[in-house]
């Protein structure tokens, strides 16, 4: 065999060494490329594991949580299941009271008599709030509602039926105040505010009576 | 106008019982309802019981089941029977239609106290 056989030979062996050297240095990159993906997508799955478990817990809070609101709201009920309704039919509740206006036209007198027969009074404003309901519950209607307010004569005070005399602070009764009448001066409301008038008068009124706020 | 007399107060002891009378000088047969009213000293007087003229009584909750109102229409007279009493049913005691009111008469004082 010649030298330069022997050389052609040798360069060839070179070239293949060089080209298995490559190739693997290439399995190589290729497998460390891989264990560092597989490495990212450890750690990613490591945090979606770890995300998870935390918004389980939070839903295993909020369930716990809902599961109390539910007790609450069942034990509510069955309190409420209990009670009776808080104003008969057709009455209208507000407050600590329940309302009902009439349906027709009488007296003042003949007005306390049917509020009296359904265990009731003619209408008394307590506060502004009342004020303010009976105001907005009448807004609707431009009729005269008699109310539980009433003197005798000019000389006498303003008395609800109880006997409790008008708060000076939360209307002004307006009208025929100085008249005499033989059956009494009473108070009506229209159109949101009081006037005085002969008790004998027709007119609408307002019966109230205190509401059942009281489990049975 | 109608005149009213009260009468039948008088110093009694817790759990004592009183009656109370109101004679009016004219008929209280035609009137809605007439009532007892009572005033404390430093109070507003409020309502303590009423009755109509078909026959229904109301009551103030403070009084329910101790005090019984009543009338006897041929006298014109309206009781009040007053049981089981009670320091702060001390108060002045009137008489007077409900609403309406005539003129009040004097009252008849109740003093509860041992």
């Known amino acids: 065999m010649q030298l330069s056989q022997v050389s052609d030979l040798l360069t060839q062996e070179q070239a293949n060494l060089t080209h298995q050297k490559k190739k693997l240095e290439g399995q190589i990159s290729a497998r460390q490329q891989a264990e560092e993906a597989s490495q990212e997508s450890e750690n990613e799955l490591k945090e979606m594991i770890e995300t998870l478990a935390r918004k389980l817990n939070e839903k295993s809070k909020e369930q716990m949580e809902l599961h109390h609101q539910n007790l609450n709201l069942q034990e509510t009920l069955k309190r409420v299941a209990n009670c009776s309704a808080p104003c008969p039919q057709d009455w209208i509740w507000h407050g600590e009271n329940c309302y009902l206006f009439s349906s027709g036209s009488f007296n003042w007198e003949k007005s306390q008599e049917k509020c009296l027969s359904l265990d009731a009074k003619l209408l008394k404003i307590n506060s502004t709030a009342d004020l303010d309901f009976i105001q907005q519950a009448i807004s609707y209607s431009s009729f005269p509602f008699w109310m539980g307010l009433s003197r005798r004569n000019p000389s006498y005070p303003w008395l609800w039926e109880d006997g409790s005399p008008l708060m000076p602070h939360l209307f002004r009764v307006r009208g025929a105040v100085s008249q005499t009448y033989p059956s009494g001066t009473c108070a009506y409301i229209q159109r949101g505010a009081v006037y005085a008038e002969n008790c004998i008068l027709a007119a609408f009124s307002i019966c109230q009576k205190k509401a059942n706020l009281r489990a049975q | 106008e109608v005149q009213l007399v009260e009468s039948g107060g008088g110093l009694v002891q817790p759990g004592g019982s009183l009656r109370l009378s109101c004679a009016a000088s004219?008929?209280?047969?035609?009137?809605?309802?007439m009532a007892w009213y009572r005033q404390a000293p430093g109070k507003q007087r409020e309502l303590v019981a009423h009755?109509?003229?078909?026959?229904?009584?109301g009551y103030a909750d403070s009084v329910k089941g101790r005090f019984t109102i009543s009338s006897d229409n041929a006298k014109n007279t309206v009781y009040l029977q007053m049981n089981s009493l009670k320091p702060e049913d001390t108060a002045v005691y009137y008489c007077?239609?409900?609403?309406?009111?005539?003129?009040w008469g004097q009252g008849t004082q109740v003093t509860v106290s041992s």
């Open positions: 007077n239609r409900l609403g309406l009111h005539w003129s």
């Open positions: 009755l109509t003229n078909s026959g229904r009584t």
């Open positions: 004219g008929s209280i047969f035609t009137i809605n309802a």
